[in-house]
């Protein structure tokens, strides 16, 4: 019987080259969180395990930092980072809860400014 709900940052945008914090929060349940997985589409980005702590996937080690809390920080953003991100909470006794965040990475305002206003 799953009574909990996951609150997320929802749809967010960030500038290319910048960083962003992905945050989820599980509420309205007494269930105990044993692990949180962070995934991008079908790719595993990171795991925060109650016993083992954080594990960042090798392919994301340079650009992903654990935290704050159970959240995840994405750095050196590229346009290719645009897309869906999922936080998957493994809990006892409720089982699995999943939250969704959509990230849009925009060209930096400097780049946009330079493209729009050309020096004669």
């Amino acid at each position: 019987m799953m009574t909990g709900t996951i609150e997320t940052t929802g749809n967010i945008s960030a500038e290319k080259g910048g960083s962003i914090i992905l945050q989820c929060h599980l509420s309205s349940t007494t269930a105990q969180v044993t692990q949180v997985n962070w995934e991008q589409q079908d790719q595993l980005l990171a795991i925060c395990n109650a016993d083992l702590g954080w594990h960042i996937s090798p392919s994301f080690k340079d650009r992903v930092a654990p935290g704050p809390g159970l959240g995840l920080t994405l750095q050196s953003l590229t346009v290719n980072d645009t897309g869906e991100y999922f936080c998957i909470y493994h809990t006892y006794p409720d089982g699995t809860y999943t939250g969704r965040i959509f990230l849009e990475v925009l060209e930096s305002s400097v780049a946009e400014h330079g493209a729009r206003f050309q020096i004669p």
Epitope: M1, Q32, T34, A50, P93, T96
Partner: antibody, heavy 119, light 108 residues
Framework: QVQLVQSGSELKKPGASVKVSCKAS????????LNWVRQAPGQGLEWMGW????????TYVQGFTGRFVFSLDTSVSTAYLQISSLKAEDTAVYYC????????????WGQGTTVTVSS | EIVLTQSPGTLFLSPGERATLSCRAS???????LVWYQQKPGQAPRLLIY???TRATGIPDRFSGSGSGTDFTLTIRRLEPEDFALYYC?????????FGQGTKLEIN
């Protein structure tokens, strides 16, 4: 290795209290939920409830409220089941078991503590 | 609450035979959160199968779980002498997380 070690058998008189301990080793007690399960003589398993070892918040099944208390002492990696105002029908083996997810299951069990209530 | 009915109550078989144990729920078990345990006399239960079909660590592959909704099965492919024991199913679909009454597997 991961294990739960329970305290020894208890013989109590009706109306008395008993406190059963369950010591976790090989993992951090506060990483996983802790369940209590009762098995009366010759009977099946009965889930009594569980305690969130992170928050200390207990959840009791109907029929195990009032006289039954789940508690923790994280400094010694131990969970406790206290039963007060003991009755003859409380005679049973009491097991602690680690709650693991996901999917949920009880993956590691204590060896059980026999509580006998007799005058 | 969900009532789990296990059948048969007792199953008489010989080593080398195949055992099929049934667990039927009074209502659908959400997400197939069904677990099987084995218990031998004087011992604590031992986790065999969780999520209806996933074998627990260290469990031989002669044990398999199947089913969904209200009907679940534990199959032991070739019985070994150490498999003769009590078997319980438990559901995590809805609180309270009830157990079946058990199936006793006895040597014929």
């Amino acid at each position: 290795q991961v294990q739960l070690v329970q305290s020894g058998s208890e013989l109590k008189k009706p109306g008395a209290s008993v406190k059963v301990s369950c010591k976790a080793s090989g993992y951090t007690l506060t990483s996983h939920a802790l369940n209590w399960v009762r098995q009366a003589p010759g009977q099946g398993l009965e889930w009594m409830g569980w305690i969130n070892t992170n928050t200390g918040n207990p959840t009791y099944v109907q029929g195990f409220t009032g006289r039954f208390v789940f508690s923790l002492d994280t400094s010694v990696s131990t969970a406790y089941l206290q039963i007060s105002s003991l009755k003859a029908e409380d005679t049973a083996v009491y097991y602690c078991a680690r709650g693991y997810s996901s999917p949920p299951r009880m993956d590691v069990w204590g060896q059980g503590t026999t509580v006998t209530v007799s005058s | 609450e969900i009532v789990l009915t296990q059948s048969p109550g007792t199953l008489f078989l010989s080593p080398g035979e195949r055992a099929t144990l049934s667990c039927r729920a009074s209502q659908s078990v959400s997400r197939n959160y069904l677990v099987w345990y084995q218990q031998k006399p004087g011992q604590a239960p031992r986790l065999l199968i969780y999520g209806a079909s996933t074998r627990a660590t260290g469990i031989p592959d002669r044990f398999s779980g199947s089913g969904s909704g209200t009907d679940f099965t534990l199959t032991i492919r070739r019985l070994e002498p150490e498999d003769f024991a009590l078997y319980y199913c438990q559901q995590y679909g809805s609180s309270p997380f009830t157990f079946g009454q058990g199936t006793k597997l006895e040597i014929n």
